[in-house]
Amino acid sequence: VPRWRQQWSGPGTTKRFPETVLARCVKYTEIHPEMRHVDCQSVWDAFKGAFISKHPCNITEEDYQPLMKLGTQTVPCNKILLWSRIKDLAHQFTQVQRDMFTLEDTLLGYLADDLTWCGEFNTSKINYQSCPDWRKDCSNNPVSVFWKTVSRRFAEAACDVVHVMLNGSRSKIFDKNSTFGSVEVHNLQPEKVQTLEAWVIHGGREDSRDLCQDPTIKELESIISKRNIQFSCKNIYRPDKFLQCVKNPEDSSCTSEI
């Protein structure tokens, strides 16, 4: 590693990042007919343009606007599933409940899911050694700003009843510092969204607690109510049903159409 290269606290860009983004784009546009018009090379160029040659602690939402424009996508606004600290289960749910969508079921979310990336000021190189950590280095890094941007847009698009899946096994079931708590909650549009329904997923097999009475859920209810959106919370006790559906996604038990 050249001595002058900035050393950040977080992991570096995911290996084969350009190839991965391009391959994901091609795959997504093949599977989703409504996105077949998307030119994946242009998408990659716009993605690259958002962070290449820029200081990785000085990225803005504006930097991602060309990518946002190319990735514009309409999902049914009343079928949105948000999540916090329970990504895998939320994705398992939408894998089988095909008429509901998480952010990672959209093109832009799919492209970036689980990836890390950053560049360097005044050089066209991608930094594969290290990238800024949100806490230890800076919050305006390429990855954080990307997710803040797409999460805000996703929440703004939501309407009617919006669901959010929360992890009942965590000490903070609702964490106001999470992307959901800091971005999505505040960008739901009261004139479009009637209700936010929280699904609190229980982990323990003998768990009979009412986690909807948790203080952090009360905090979420307060935030949502102040925004003139109704709030509902449901305890969900049998997540093993979701796992069964991942094994057999075509099975009739994997749809809520009764």
Partner: antibody, heavy 120, light 107 residues
Framework: QVQLVESGGGLVQPGGSLRLSCAAS????????MNWVRQAPGKGLEWVSG????????YYADSVKGRFTISRDNSKNTLYLQMNSLRAEDTAVYYC?????????????WGQGTLVTVSS | DIELTQPPSVSVAPGQTARISCSGD??????VYWYQQKPGQAPVLVIY???KRPSGIPERFSGSNSGNTATLTISGTQAEDEADYYC??????????FGGGTKLTVL
């Protein structure tokens, strides 16, 4: 279409045993939680026991805990309820019921029931 | 364990709206299910997840759940709706409970 057919009911003396069976067809049996629900003559519904897909999560109502055992054989598409130390208050129609999918925990389909009478 | 309380009986004239309540502590935090049972028959699911209707159930059946009370509403009640109705919820582990049932009489 979905079918649940219970069998094994009958007259038994207090302290006796019975084994109920529920034959399932028309759906992938191994993908669902299954349950037993009973109804005493002229009374309401009472959930008895439930079992998950792989028999790793098993639940009983307090009224039958330690006396009844639920089990399933996914290769035979069959649910069982072994009832021991039967009491007069166990007299009821016993229904086999299939759980709803995903976030829902209710009963989408029911069998026609089998009558268990505990009397001397 | 949560306890579900239903009125023992409800009467309604044909064509009118019948409402059957089901109450329990913080019931809004749990999904509620409603079953119809006619004499000598097995129960039939009429509402799941508070307000969703299974296919084949007439549109006149609807459900709601807020506060401590869930309600089954039958609009334009017909003679064939005369039956016993049970609410049910699940509060985790071995806590799957039914209400005591409500006998609906269509006058």
């Amino acid at each position: 279409q979905v079918q649940l057919v219970e069998s094994g009911g009958g007259l038994v003396q207090p302290g006796g045993s019975l084994r109920l069976s529920c034959a399932a067809s028309g759906f992938t049996f191994s993908s669902y939680y299954m349950n037993w629900v009973r109804q005493a003559p002229g009374k309401g519904l009472e959930w008895v026991s439930g079992i998950n897909m792989e028999s790793t999560r098993i639940y009983y109502a307090d009224s039958v805990k330690g006396r009844f055992t639920i089990s399933r054989d996914n290769s035979k598409n069959t649910l069982y309820l072994q009832m021991n130390s039967l009491r007069a208050e166990d007299t009821a129609v016993y229904y086999c019921a299939r759980d709803l999918p995903l976030v829902y925990t209710g009963f989408a389909y029911w069998g026609q029931g089998t009558l268990v009478t505990v009397s001397s | 364990d949560i306890e579900l309380t239903q009125p023992p009986s409800v009467s309604v004239a044909p064509g009118q709206t019948a409402r059957i309540s089901c109450s329990g502590d913080n019931l809004r935090h749990y999904y509620v299910y409603w079953y119809q049972q006619k004499p000598g028959q097995a129960p039939v699911l009429v509402i799941y997840g508070d307000s969703k209707r299974p296919s084949g159930i007439p549109e006149r059946f609807s459900g709601s759940n807020s506060g401590n009370t869930a309600t089954l509403t039958i609009s334009g009640t017909q003679a064939e709706d005369e039956a016993d109705y049970y609410c049910q919820t699940y509060t985790g582990g071995a806590s799957l409970v039914f209400g005591g049932g409500t006998k609906l009489t269509v006058l």
